[in-house]
């Protein structure tokens, strides 16, 4: 047979679906690998073929489209499960071909079990919303294409295991869930259960979104250096260990890159001959403000080291800050008597 352009296993698309729920999976060829869509391919005489490899097996086999109630079917470039079963887990391949052309890609499909509180191994999308912001809406995700617009499904929203009824600042509005002046206590997993009829059967779609309330843009600031500061003097004798923490507070800024670094006499630590160790740690507040600490240490400090200029620098998308550490050599402890 002719050579086939094999795009391999597309692990970027780790598709997870819940057991005993409908699932519609589009062939990734048309979304990520080929320049044309299914309609163009089909009208050009190309055929889309599906097959799969069961979990823990090596053998590729055709998908059985003759199951009772058409449990698995194909419609254009979509593979349908109505509904899924646990043993549908495996690697699925869609192949587009005719007598002269062939292109295929495989992708993993995992059918996941959930408990009555929607706990599962499913990875949930995270929706970040700004604290105290007026209104945030989240929409029940990935339900498009499951039922026609003429069908009005019922939607029930849950926070964790609790149905959202009379929550003071969270209001279910069909497919949307509105948050009014959100607080950190609104953090959590929010689940919509969409129920719709099809051919005399009721199907359920379960979708969960993790809500994380984060600092507001109105509170965003340039980095604030807590340490070093003008109040603390690092007074050492030669031979002692010098330890200077650079502690910087970064308010949450969406997609900001927060940086902290030291310079010694204007140079990066890697560019000086001093034997310096730098250790970094990061902690986060409830609203994802970040405190980043870089500890500069010199095991056995020399008189020259104590004359150097140690500066902590910090940067985020709002600006930059720098602060020099006050380092000096300890006196010998003698004090001359004052003569009048």
């Amino acid at each position: 047979s002719e050579r086939c352009d094999d795009w391999g296993l597309d692990t970027m698309r780790q598709i997870q679906v819940f057991e005993d729920e409908p699932a519609r999976i589009k062939c990734p060829l048309f979304e990520h690998f080929l320049k044309y869509n299914y309609s163009t391919a089909h009208s050009s005489g190309l055929t889309l073929i599906w097959y799969w490899t069961r979990q823990d097996r090596d053998l590729e086999e055709p998908i059985n489209f003759r199951l009772p109630e058409n449990r698995i079917s194909k419609e254009k470039d979509v593979l349908w499960f109505r509904p899924t079963l646990l043993n549908d887990t495996g690697n699925y391949t869609c192949m587009l071909r005719n007598t002269t052309y062939c292109s295929k890609v495989a992708f993993p499909l995992e059918v996941v079990q959930k408990d009555s509180c929607f706990n599962s191994a499913m990875r949930f999308p995270v929706h970040k919303m700004y604290i105290e912001h007026g209104i945030h809406k989240i929409t029940c995700p990935n339900v498009d294409g499951y039922f026609p617009s003429s069908v009005k499904p019922s939607v029930t929203w849950y926070k964790g295991c609790t149905e959202i009824v009379d929550f003071h600042n969270v209001l279910p509005e069909g497919m949307n869930l509105s948050f009014f002046i959100p607080l950190v206590s609104n953090n959590g997993n929010y689940t919509c259960v969409v129920t719709y009829p099809e051919n005399g059967r009721l199907f359920h779609l379960t979708r969960t979104v993790t809500v994380k309330v984060v600092g507001s843009p109105k509170d965003a600031l340039p980095p604030q250096i807590y340490s070093p500061n003008d109040r603390v003097v690092y007074e050492k004798e030669p031979g002692e260990e010098l330890v200077i923490p650079c502690k910087v507070y970064f308010s949450f800024i969406m997609d900001s890159h927060n940086e902290v670094w030291w310079t010694i006499d204007g140079k990066k630590p890697d560019d000086v001959t001093v034997d310096i160790t730098i250790n970094e740690s990061v902690s986060y507040s409830s609203t994802e403000d970040e405190t980043r600490t870089q500890i500069l240490s010199i095991k056995k400090v020399t008189p020259e080291d104590l004359r150097r200029n140690y500066v902590c620098h910090a940067r985020n998308t709002k600006g930059e800050a720098e602060q020099a550490a006050k380092v000096k050599q300890k006196g010998n402890g003698c004090t001359e008597p004052m003569t009048l």
Partner: antibody
């Protein structure tokens, strides 16, 4: 210096309406969420309503929901509380206060007395 | 809604003595608890936020502690100007709720 100055209180009959205002100065009003807290004579404090800094989000205590409306005009640095269908139990000193999630109600006005009586 | 319960309702203390006020939440409010002082005819004044952080200009004799459901406001050595009503308030969940208040009076 931060200042919040309420006005608009007074005597009103049951079923009547009143509009309270709160003029803010000394801080960036448009960056501050705000709210109203009331205190019935000889009683404790009761949160009434809140509004987000952008004016889009509003919340109300169950006791006033559907009757009171909070709003703000950031260009005038002013917070409002429109009170309709007033009842005798709405009689109280009404305080406007700035709030932040991190510090709660950190600045308060001096209060304005609303008396609902026939 | 979260119910805040303060105890005692009234606390009689001599000037210079220590006063300890308690506040209990019906469910966890994390550290999102504030304490206010109110004197007759005046607006409340923020003393403590975040359960233990003193607000700007508040003397060091006022301290707050606790997290979750149990909180304490301590006034280490009562001054004459400290005799007032003290309210706790949770701002973890909407609706924000206040305790019924503790009156600190001169013994």
């Amino acid at each position: 210096e931060v200042q919040l100055l309420e006005s608009g209180g007074g005597l009103v009959q049951p079923g009547g309406s009143l509009r309270l205002s709160c003029a803010a100065s000394g801080f960036t009003f448009e960056h501050s969420s705000a709210g109203w807290v009331r205190q019935a004579p000889g009683k404790g404090l009761e949160w009434v309503s809140a509004i987000s800094y952008d004016g889009e989000g509003t919340l109300y205590a169950d006791s006033v929901k559907g009757r009171f409306t909070i709003s703000r005009d950031n260009s005038k640095n002013t917070l409002y509380l429109q009170m309709n269908s007033l009842r005798a139990e709405d009689t109280a000193v009404y305080y406007c206060a700035r709030f932040r999630y991190y510090t709660a109600f950190d600045y308060w006005g001096q209060g304005t007395l609303v008396t609902v009586s026939s | 809604e979260i119910v805040m319960t303060q105890s005692p309702a009234t606390l009689s203390v001599s000037p210079g003595e220590r006063a300890t006020l308690s506040c209990r939440a019906s469910q966890s409010v994390s550290s999102n608890l504030a304490w206010y002082q109110q004197k007759p005819g005046q607006a409340p004044r923020l003393l403590i936020y975040g359960a233990s952080t003193r607000a700007t200009g508040i003397p060091a004799r006022f301290s707050g502690s606790g997290s979750g459901t149990e909180f304490t406001l301590t006034i280490s050595s009562l001054q004459s100007e400290d005799f007032a009503v003290y309210y706790c308030q949770q701002y973890n969940n909407w609706p924000w709720t206040f305790g019924q208040g503790t009156k600190v009076e001169i013994k």
